[in-house]
Interface confidence: medium
């Protein structure tokens, strides 16, 4: 455009700029070392020092580890970006007893409140569950309409908050690919190794190049590129697609130049700990106890407890979907303890496959 | 398997440079930043600094700044470090060493050493 | 910088015995400690990261914990191969540092 010319002529003769043609103007040249918080910087401020991935820049300007959400008990709640740690809170159905910088050092199941007692506040990430007494004559299960909604989650009866001892050695990863395991011993396994090809065993779409062309000579207009299997994360960053190897995973979208795979457990299982994009534990779809009812909560960060169904009654643990389906199995089922904030139509017939948001952070293999 | 093989023994005089290499193999070269760690013998562990192969970024240790320059050819999946204006202070291994993953996982690759002796 | 101190240059031990390594930092790492194993002429071996993470293939008789400023490396049961050099690391920010090494020698 001839009319540019007097804006890119500003820039020549000016070492320290550059014009970028994508925004039309003069941009401030980083110094060697420094890394542009934006496509133009305009100046210096606008510069800084680059991290590896994993880590953030900190007040101080050194690269500091954003904390690790790996152990089972915890969940992302905010992404490690290149200012700021990753935040981790303990998984739905439990709360933090000892908290820790950007994290919870001990995270306790919600308790359940003993009979005669009913649910004041619903337990969160923070706070346990506060109860309280029940009105005369008002069954403890059903002492309020909440109380009452199709359920969300459930977890064992507890006394008295249970804590889970942080996970060592490689408990704090995912399963591994062989549908023979147990859920319990396959959830301390891995996933995939960093430097493994694409999860199913073909080539994935190349998600480093942009459909933009090579770089135009001192064009800010460059897309980064990642290599195969990793995807340009919103902090620029090159991030390992998750992989949907595991026997009890399938691909639901695949891993693109700037989105990662996703993958959900396959047909007539059901997620019981959630990952980013993915799902750390698939179970079999669940067989109901008959002793036990559950007490919904909350969808979102709350989670419901199982107790003694009211005398008379019986459990109701697989109730019709909204959308009309008949449930998997005309049996009661028990309602897993599901770490994510998934619709509220659960259990889900076993026909669909099971997709559940993303809360925790697969761990890469260490090679 | 990722492996780093490092180039031979270097003999220096003080006052002059010297330049190692990584030859890095088992994996896509830029996918992992290059960390350069100092040992000195009968001494512990210092990390020099790193580069990001793939854009040829580079961040030291601010006490080897004037000391170590970090370079990374994509094309050989090598990298460089050249240490120049040496003393005696500086004969030690230097090794390269890459994580395991991106997940805080630390040195989980290492090369075999490059031992560098300065002595008139 | 972070320093990382390793109290004890030696430690001596028996085989069969449990041994426990100890670090402090300068500050509060939370927990991005990582320790490596070092044998003469040898380059070292990553064992333990976050605290408590065990390294890909590294037997199940080393153990890490610790948090904020305190970190401990344990051999339940030392084996003659387990003889070499200890040393922690802090991965939390930059520059990474190292303490000085624990050497791990037979009574």
């Known amino acids: 455009f001839p009319q540019d010319r007097p804006f890119e002529d500003t820039c020549h003769g000016n070492p320290s700029h550059y014009y970028d043609k994508a925004v039309r103007r003069c941009c401030y040249r980083c110094p060697m070392g420094l890394f542009p918080t934006q496509q133009c910087p305009q100046r210096p401020t606008d510069c800084r020092k680059q991290c590896e991935p994993d880590y953030y820049l900190d007040e101080a300007d050194r690269c500091t580890a954003c904390v690790t959400c790996s152990r089972d008990d915890l969940v992302e709640k905010t992404p490690c970006a290149w200012n700021s740690s990753r935040v981790c809170e303990c998984r739905p159905g439990m709360f933090c007893s000892t908290s820790a910088v950007n994290s919870c050092a001990r995270c306790f199941f919600h308790s359940v409140c003993p009979a005669g007692m009913i649910v004041k506040f619903p337990g969160t990430a923070q706070k346990n569950t506060v109860c309280e007494p029940a009105s005369p004559g008002v069954s403890p299960a059903c002492a309020s309409p909440e109380n009452c909604k199709e359920p969300s989650s459930g977890t064992i009866p507890q006394a008295k908050p249970t804590p889970v001892s942080p996970a060592t050695s490689s408990a704090s990863t995912m399963p591994v690919r062989g549908g023979t395991r147990l859920a319990q011993e396959a959830a301390s396994k891995l996933t995939r190794a960093p430097d493994s090809p694409s999860s199913v065993g073909r080539p994935s779409s190349d998600p480093g190049l942009s459909p933009t062309q090579p770089c135009p000579e001192g064009s800010g207009d460059c897309r980064k590129q990642c290599e195969p299997d990793y995807y340009l994360d919103e902090a620029g960053r090159c991030t390992a697609c998750v992989s949907c190897s595991r026997d009890d995973l399938v691909e639901k979208t695949p891993c693109a130049w700037n989105s990662s795979r996703t993958c959900e457990c396959r047909p007539g299982m059901i997620c019981a700990t959630s990952a980013t994009n993915s799902c750390a534990r698939c179970v079999p779809y669940p067989i109901c106890a008959a002793e036990t009812v559950t007490k919904p909560q909350d969808m979102a960060e709350k989670d419901t407890t199982f107790e003694a169904p009211p005398l008379g009654t019986q459990p109701d643990c697989n109730p019709t979907p909204e959308n009309g389906e008949a449930p998997a199995s005309t049996s009661p089922t028990q309602s897993l303890l599901v770490d994510s904030q998934a619709s509220k139509t659960l259990p889900i017939p076993t026909s669909a496959p099971v997709a559940l948001s993303s809360t925790g952070k697969p761990v890469l293999d260490a090679g | 398997q990722v492996q780093l093989q490092q180039s031979g023994a270097e003999l220096a005089k003080p006052g002059a440079s010297v330049k190692m290499s990584c030859k890095a193999s088992g994996y896509t070269f830029t996918t992992y930043w290059m960390h350069w760690v100092k040992q000195r013998p009968g001494q512990g562990l210092e990390w020099i600094g790193y580069i990001n192969p793939s854009t040829g970024y580079t961040d030291y240790n601010e006490k080897f700044k004037d000391k170590a320059t970090l370079t990374a050819d994509k094309s050989s999946s090598t990298a460089y470090m050249q240490l120049s204006s040496l003393t005696s202070e500086d004969s030690a291994v230097y090794y390269c060493?890459?994580?395991?993953?991106?997940?805080?996982?630390?040195?989980?690759?290492w090369g075999q050493g490059t031992l560098v002796s300065v002595s008139a | 910088d972070i320093v990382m101190t390793q109290s004890h240059k030696f430690m001596s031990t028996s085989v069969g015995d449990r041994v426990t390594i100890t670090c402090k930092a300068s500050?509060?790492?939370?927990?991005?400690v990582a320790w490596y194993q070092q044998k003469p002429g040898h380059s070292p071996k990553l064992l333990i990261y976050?605290?408590?993470t065990r390294h890909t293939g590294v037997p199940d008789r080393f153990t890490g914990s610790g948090s904020g400023t305190d970190y401990t490396l344990t051999i339940s049961s030392v084996q003659v191969e387990d003889l070499a050099l200890y040393y922690c690391q802090q991965h939390y920010s930059t520059p990474f540092t190292f303490g000085s090494g624990t050497k791990l020698e037979i009574k």
């Open positions: 976050w605290a408590s």
């Open positions: 500050q509060d790492v939370s927990t991005a």
């Open positions: 060493v890459r994580r395991g993953s991106y997940d805080g996982n630390p040195f989980a690759y």
